[in-house]
């Protein structure tokens, strides 16, 4: 199904406009900002979601040490260019002709340049580390129960195949979720780890992208899991190219 047939809405993306103008009067939904048709049975790509967000009104030690090549999204929001499949174009530019290269999750992976900057290919982010800190609780969560709950969440809510959740680490109050997905592993129809991580990030912030679905209510054996900060690290199949100036 492309959208909920009974009331013509998109369950997986509230930032859409839907109407029964598809083949045979079927409900069809288009992303705000880009006008691209979206498949409402799965997650919408992060590129289209960012574009929609920018078009919307503004008021609307078992722990892993991230590698030296890990990227954090310090640039924040921008209005991206998406390809016809809804993926980020490798080169992004702003209105003042400043350009940079991004990875498959839209995070800058080079220094900023001008229109002459070349980005030969869209480099895949194959490893995402989601670093969470939970609010104080009476005691630590049972690691196995916490691990299973987060794996269930990614399967059920984000439709991410269980094979892509590589590990869940826990040292109270820090939780780390590792998502891994190589180009060769990702089959047609598989949710992209970058899209799942983005939906999760928005859920954690109380900004759910789902339509008509309650916000995220994470519980471990009935005990609420409340996240007070989130950091997401992105590792690309090819290390990023930044000048030494940025590293100092």
């Amino acid at each position: 199904h492309t959208a909920a047939q009974d009331n013509c809405t998109c369950p997986t993306n509230k930032m859409t406009v839907c109407s029964p103008d598809g083949p045979g009067g079927r409900c069809q939904c288009r992303a705000l900002g880009s006008g691209m048709a979206v498949d409402c049975s799965t997650l919408t790509s992060k590129c289209l979601l960012l574009k929609a967000r920018m078009s919307a009104p503004k008021n609307a030690r078992t722990l892993v040490r991230p590698s030296e090549h890990a990227l954090v999204d310090n640039d924040g929001l921008y209005d991206p260019d998406c390809d016809p499949e809804g993926r980020f174009k490798a080169r992004q530019c702003n209105q003042t002709s400043v350009c940079w290269c991004v990875n498959s999750v839209g995070v800058r992976r080079t220094d900023k340049g001008d229109l002459s900057l070349r980005c030969d290919e869209l480099v895949r982010t194959h490893h995402i580390l989601i670093d969470l800190r939970h609010r104080p609780t009476a005691g630590a969560f049972n690691h196995s129960d916490l691990d299973a709950e987060l794996r269930r969440l990614f399967r059920e809510r984000y439709r991410l195949h269980p094979k892509f959740v590589a590990a869940v680490h826990y040292e109270q109050p820090t939780i780390q979720i590792e998502l891994r997905q190589n180009t060769s592993q990702k089959a047609a129809g598989d949710v992209d780890i970058g899209d799942a991580a983005y939906y999760f990030e928005r859920d954690i912030k109380g900004e759910s992208l789902f339509q008509g679905r309650g916000g995220l209510d994470l519980r471990v054996r009935g005990e609420p899991l409340q996240v007070e900060r989130t950091l997401i690290y992105y590792l690309d199949e090819i290390p990023p190219k930044f000048s030494m100036k940025r590293l100092t």
Epitope: H1, A4, Q5, S41, S144, D147, A148, E149, R151, R152, R155, E156, R157, R159, L160, H161, P162, K163, V165, A167, V168, V191, R213, G214, R219, R221
Partner: antibody
């Protein structure tokens, strides 16, 4: 072709343990989840728990916690469910089922466990 | 735990009849799953994500609903449809099933 083949019927005495096996074929074993569900004679379906085959992560329902053990042998693509301290109410057909982005997409044929003195 | 209550518990109908089975959740769930079980056999996935037919399931089966109220409809009963039907949720641990609806020949 995806297949889950379970071990044969068992008759056990109260207080004993039973170990049911579920041999998988037709898919990459460690990419999936195996859930266990039981059905008492003439009754409905009751979920016991599940094991993530790649990581070994396990979740048991509260009712069975402490009495059930789920394991997997990746070398033989076989999942196991052991239930201890058996009582007559544990008489049921026990099913294994594969999980992916669905809770259960393929099921084993079931194993009848009879607990009787 | 989320309780699922199916109604009716049993139902007699004839070939060609339209049949509706409802499943009510004790709290809101994201999606409902439906299974068909025949005597002596394992359950078979019928409908996932509330309304999507599993592979090989005839189009006479349909599912709908949201929140706490869901339905399974068989538009024109066929002889092979006489079985027991279960709804199931996995929006939160533990996964739970409805008590089942036994569909019998009138």
């Amino acid at each position: 072709e995806v297949q889950l083949v379970q071990s044969g019927p068992e008759v056990k005495k109260p207080g004993a343990s039973v170990k049911v096996s579920c041999k998988a074929s037709g898919f990459t074993f460690t990419d999936y989840v195996i859930g266990w569900v039981r059905q008492a004679p003439g009754q409905g379906l009751e979920w016991i728990g599940e094991i993530y085959l790649g990581s070994g992560t396990i979740y048991y329902t509260q009712k069975f916690k402490g009495r059930v053990t789920m394991t997997a042998d990746t070398s033989t693509s076989t999942a196991y469910m052991e239930l201890s301290s058996l009582r007559s109410e544990d008489t049921a057909v026990y099913y294994c089922a594969r999980g992916s982005i669905f809770p259960f997409d393929y099921w084993g044929q079931g194993t009848l466990v009879t607990v009787s003195s | 735990d989320i309780q699922l209550t199916q109604s009716p518990s049993s139902l007699s109908a004839s070939v060609g009849d339209r049949v509706t089975i409802t499943c009510r959740a004790s709290s809101s769930v994201s999606y409902m799953y439906w299974y068909q079980q025949k005597p002596g056999k394992a359950p078979k996935l019928l409908i996932y994500d509330t309304s999507t037919l599993a592979s090989g399931v005839p189009s006479r089966f349909s599912g709908s609903g949201s929140g706490t109220d869901f339905t399974l409809t068989i538009s024109s009963l066929q002889p092979e449809d006489f079985a027991t039907y279960y709804c199931q949720q996995w929006s939160s641990y533990p996964y739970t099933f409805g008590q089942g609806t036994k569909l019998e020949i009138k």
